[in-house]
């Protein structure tokens, strides 16, 4: 039960994360015009990975695509590549994880195969999340560098009468969406990898051995408390005297307020 929950939750978290990565990649607000300590302009500039936009006070917004590939900064190309790789890996991971879900039965698929698929998708989600985080972080670093360079330029070369206002850019909403989405995908991937451990069949064959506990003359046989599924359940089904501790599968879970996000 806990394994299924962990796997299911990992899938959902990754799904939200990948949707966020796609949204961030498509968003136009990767960098937005810095309005702090700037003359108040009636024009607001913002830029994405694919186009730059200008919104006028009139409400008119004009966006122009970057219709060049070679003329773009290498860093921007790298960010694009990282985000696309993240999306592709995430999409493949989602596809694989659907078939790996314990709650979905596809033919006579071995549980070991499901475990392998869960691990594969988990790794894919982890790499996808890392790609997104890396892409967003590279872009953020680029912004910080350019911000301070343009700030320096604002206070130099003003010997003449005419001043040119340098448009400075700061972090846009897409960066925060990307960071959160990348983090969620990463967490989802880790959860899938954890779930994989619970799905993997144990190699140990438990023999019917009599355990003689002091003061008790009871023979314990594995699988005596639950009907064995024949897949890694022996470890869970062993009842031990542990002062009333119960295995995860047996604990009654109650919904908490944090379950509803």
């Amino acid at each position: 039960m806990a394994v299924t929950a962990c796997q299911g939750l990992g899938f959902v978290v990754s799904l939200i994360g990948i949707a966020g990565i796609i949204a961030a990649t498509c968003m136009d607000q990767w960098s937005t015009q810095d309005l702090y300590n700037n003359p108040v302009t009636a024009v607001f500039n913002y830029q994405g990975l694919w186009r730059s936009c200008v919104r006028e006070s009139s409400g008119f917004t004009e966006c122009r695509g970057y219709f060049t590939l070679l003329g773009l900064p290498a860093m921007l190309q790298a960010v694009r590549a990282l985000m696309i790789v993240g999306i592709v890996l995430g999409a493949i991971g989602l596809l694989v994880s659907i078939f790996a879900l314990k709650c979905i039965r596809i033919g006579s698929m071995e549980d070991s195969a499901k475990a392998n698929m869960t691990l594969t998708s988990g790794i894919m989600f982890i790499v996808s999340g890392l790609c997104a985080i890396a892409g967003v972080s590279v872009f953020a670093n680029m912004l910080v560098t350019n911000f301070w360079m343009s700030t320096a330029n604002m206070y130099t070369g003003m010997g003449g009468m005419v001043q040119t206002v340098q448009t400075r850019y700061t972090f846009g909403a897409a960066l925060f969406v990307g960071w959160v989405a990348g983090g969620l995908t990463l967490i989802g991937g880790v959860m899938m990898c954890i779930a994989c451990r619970g799905l993997a069949p144990e190699e140990t064959n438990y023999k019917a051995v009599s355990y003689h506990a002091s003061g008790h003359s009871v023979a314990y046989k594995p699988g005596g408390f639950k009907a064995s599924t024949g897949f890694g359940s022996n470890t869970k089904n062993k009842k031990i005297y542990d002062g009333g501790a119960r295995t995860e599968d047996e604990v009654q879970s109650y919904p908490s307020k944090h379950d509803y996000v």
């Epitope: 015009q33 003359p39 108040v40 302009t41 009636a42 024009v43 500039n45 913002y46 830029q47 730059s52 936009c53 200008v54 006028e56 006070s57 009139s58 409400g59 008119f60 004009e62 122009r64 005419v162 001043q163 040119t164 206002v165 340098q166 448009t167």
Partner: antibody, heavy 118, light 113 residues
Framework: QIQLVQSGPELKKPGETVKISCKAS????????MNWVKQAPGKGLKWMGW????????TYADDFKGRFAFSSETSARTAYLQINNLKNEDMATYFC???????????WGQGTLVTVSS | DIVMTQSPSFLTVTAGEKVTMSCKSS????????????LTWYQQKPGQPPKLLIY???TRDSGVPDRFTGSGSGTDFTLTITSVQAEDLAVFYC?????????FGSGTKLEIK
Amino acid sequence: QIQLVQSGPELKKPGETVKISCKASGYTFTNYGMNWVKQAPGKGLKWMGWINTYTGESTYADDFKGRFAFSSETSARTAYLQINNLKNEDMATYFCATLGYGNSLAYWGQGTLVTVSS
Amino acid sequence: DIVMTQSPSFLTVTAGEKVTMSCKSSQSLLNSGNQKNYLTWYQQKPGQPPKLLIYWASTRDSGVPDRFTGSGSGTDFTLTITSVQAEDLAVFYCQNAYFYPFTFGSGTKLEIK
């Protein structure tokens, strides 16, 4: 077609209040901001500020902060300019104008002459 | 505030002549985001409200005759009327449409001989 029709001329005494209206037609009122421009007799144009007719937020030029207030009534498709505590230097023609491409003042009202005389 | 300086203040020309008027701003009106200059030209005929002629420094508004041409970039702008007509008698204003507060030039009064 887009039209801005302003209220008629006003004759006021110093210290009084005047409220000029600007009724819009031919477009979605909340889609375009409304600007106000002052033109003293025989003088040039002076931008007073504008009101975002969607949010109701106003931006005023420094010379028009305090006694001047912009407002709008979406249901009536009308923008208003109110001048409190009128002074002699407020005697002018006041124009309303909508923002267009390039933040230009694309469509203008016919103007409202405010005369301040004791 | 941005200062808009127009020259000359008065222009007297004969019909059919080419006329050029200048407008200078104290700061660049070029927006790097779209490479457009936020400079607007208006024509105000006697007893009428101003009429939009040109926005983005060089884009003619719909219905404006093609004898009106706007040019320039950054801080220096020009309005050219290739063949002045009798109905062009008016005051022409340039306006900063980039920085708040929007500011107008003092105007160039065009008179026909």
